[in-house]
Interface confidence: medium
Amino acid sequence: SLAADTPTACCFSYTSRQIPQNFIADYFETSSQCSKPGVIFLTKRSRQVCADPSEEWVQKYVSDLELSA
């Protein structure tokens, strides 16, 4: 069966404020085993921040990261 080598971190709450975009280095999606979906942003200082994937700014940051591939 399909099994992905993705991080197993889960988001139990989301950041309440928008992170400045220039702080963001990368992102990944939380595991399907988590109780709620989440995007985890990795900052340039190696901090992980949980964000709500339905928020517009989160989708914009993800799109911009994809664009920089």
């Epitope: 069966s1 399909l2 099994a3 992905a4 080598d5 993705t6 990368d26 990944f28 999606e29 939380t30 595991s31 399907s32 988590c34 979906p37 989440g38 995007v39 994937p53 989708q59 993800v62 990261l65 994809e66 591939a69």
Partner: nanobody, 123 residues
Framework: EVQLVESGGGLVQAGDSLRLACAAS????????MGWFRQAPGKEREFVGA????????YYADSVKGRFTISKDNAKNTVYLQMNSLKPEDTAVYYC????????????????WGQGTQVTVSS
């Protein structure tokens, strides 16, 4: 064994719409991204769009943005590519793929591929 099967291709007129489907069996989509790629005659395979399964985040190539939409049906383990306002330059074999790419456009990070379905757009 994971299998991806595309369907819905065909011959249409410029300006028409078409919906492609990608049905998966032998596994689940969880933690995978589902991508759509296409290959026109004599050209390299290129990224069309993709969806991250859990968050439903989508990303599209500039050439199809605003015209193509990817969606999914959890119950049917199926991903759809809705193609509107088709152009002759959209003519290609369309492939769906599953994988864990760090970036959705990274074609070589998709582990599983379908056999493709032909889409022909006539002017």
């Amino acid at each position: 064994e994971v299998q991806l099967v595309e369907s819905g291709g065909g011959l249409v007129q410029a300006g028409d719409s078409l919906r492609l489907a990608c049905a998966a069996s032998g596994g689940t989509f969880s933690n995978y991204a589902m991508g759509w790629f296409r290959q026109a005659p004599g050209k390299e395979r290129e990224f069309v769009g993709a969806l991250r399964w859990i968050t439903r985040i989508t990303y599209y190539a500039d050439s199809v943005k605003g015209r193509f939409t990817i969606s999914k049906d959890n119950a049917k383990n199926t991903v759809y590519l809705q193609m509107n306002s088709l152009k002759p330059e959209d003519t290609a074999v369309y492939y769906c793929a599953a994988g864990s790419p760090s970036r959705l456009v990274n074609m070589n990070q998709y582990n599983y591929w379908g056999q493709g379905t032909q889409v022909t757009v006539s002017s």
